[in-house]
């Protein structure tokens, strides 16, 4: 049984060349003719030289799964989903992705280091100490109050509340 | 003795339109493919469309696709290429070639010149 | 699409010589490349089918030669009616049918 060069397909005892991206086989090689292609169908693709008899089915973006569709499917490219705002995908597949989560949200005691993406989770840091953070979205710790000369420190400052201070 | 003979071409505005023909004489003209390959002026050759042996199926490059039509007349051994919405960069000799089997092409007729200019 | 580029661009020779001419695809093809010589205002004419056959009627000082992604075409030597331009076709994946460039073989 022949090897096929790259970019071949083995039919029978034969190699044929493969049809172009966007193009199935329609009819394999022969001694006088060469592989005779025909284009996708619609909602059909193949991304790469192939001998399929077939192009694949485009991918559908499940908006159930927190999808929405960032690139329509082509003859010759696949579906491209993204995450819908606020989420970032879990399970990427080269440019595919198929579920993604919600952007975690940065608890008390720390502030948003870095927002998240359609491809990344949002990066929470701690907050340093003398600031505070009640969590959320918040991209800066707030520093501690400074209770007036007028007033007593009830509580200490922590990573997650301010200084309460009374008047004396 | 094979004779392939196109005909329709001329000048034309751009946006109009124009119908070749290809008459065949000299040899069974309905078992075989037929294509048309053009050549723009002091440049090389470029495939245009093939129809099958049977007419059912027909191929377009992606530069003419939407505004080419190519058809046959078995009864009159007669091949068509109908060019609409046609562009400046459609100027080109048009010639009809007999195809094996969609693939290499033995027979050529002579061209018709298209010129397609306001 | 399979993208065929011939070299040179331009080969001055004198009758008598050999003259090779090559002809890459970009992917493989197969056996399923043709030859065609071109002479000013007149069709292409074919010479070479599948690589390597030459078709009826055309003089045995052709030939051809190669597959998958490299091939030659040969003039074993030149006959004043050999010079033309001369251009490669694939057919192993189709459509679309792509052509070389040309070669242009001039008398030196």
């Known amino acids: 049984q022949p090897s096929c060069r790259q970019e071949e397909f083995l039919v029978g005892d034969e190699c044929c060349p493969m049809c172009n991206p966007g193009y199935h086989v329609k009819q394999v090689c022969s001694e006088h003719t060469g592989t005779v292609c025909a284009p996708c169908p619609p909602q059909t693709y193949t991304a790469h030289a192939n001998g399929l008899s077939k192009c694949l089915p485009c991918g559908v973006c499940d908006p159930d799964m927190g999808l929405l569709t960032w690139q329509e499917c082509s003859s010759w490219k696949d579906t491209v989903c993204r995450c819908i705002p606020g989420y970032f995908c879990e399970n990427q597949d080269g440019s595919h992705c198929s579920t993604c989560l919600q952007h975690t949200t940065c608890p008390p005691g720390q502030r948003v280091e870095k927002r998240g993406t359609h491809d990344q989770d949002t990066v929470c840091a701690d907050c340093l100490t003398g600031t505070f953070s009640l969590g959320g979205t918040q991209e800066e710790c707030l520093p501690w109050t400074n209770c007036s000369a007028f007033q007593q420190e009830v509580r200490r400052g922590t990573n997650s509340t301010d200084t309460t201070c009374s008047s004396q | 003795e094979v004779q392939l003979l196109e005909s329709g071409g001329g000048l034309v505005q751009p946006g109009g339109s124009l119908r070749l023909s290809c008459a065949a004489s000299?040899?069974?003209?309905?078992?075989?493919?037929w294509t048309w390959v053009r050549q723009a002026p002091g440049k090389g050759l470029e495939w245009v469309s093939t129809i099958s042996a049977s007419g059912d199926s027909t191929y377009y490059a992606d530069s003419v696709k939407g505004r080419f039509t190519i058809s046959r007349d078995n009864s009159k051994n007669t091949l068509y290429l109908q060019m609409n919405s046609l562009r400046a960069e459609d100027t080109a000799v048009y010639y009809c070639?007999?195809?094996?089997?969609?693939?290499?092409?033995?027979?050529w007729g002579q061209g018709t010149l298209v010129t397609v200019s306001s | 699409e399979i993208v065929l580029t011939q070299s040179p661009g331009t080969l001055s020779l004198s009758p008598g010589e050999r003259a090779t001419l090559s002809c890459r695809a970009s992917?493989?093809?197969?056996?399923?490349l043709a030859w065609y010589q071109q002479k000013p205002g007149q069709a292409p004419r074919l010479l070479i089918y599948?690589?390597?056959s030459l078709q009826s009627g055309i003089p045995d000082r052709f030939s051809g030669s190669g597959s998958g992604t490299d091939f030659t075409l040969t003039i074993s030597r030149l006959e004043p009616e050999d010079f033309a331009v001369y251009y490669c076709?694939?057919?192993?994946?189709?459509?679309?049918?792509?052509f070389g460039q040309g070669t242009k073989v001039e008398i030196k």
């Open positions: 076709q694939q057919y192993g994946s189709s459509p679309p049918i792509t």
């Open positions: 070639a007999h195809d094996r089997t969609f693939g290499y092409f033995d027979y």
């Open positions: 992917r493989s093809v197969g056996k399923y």
């Open positions: 000299g040899f069974t003209f309905s078992g075989y493919y």
């Open positions: 599948a690589a390597s």
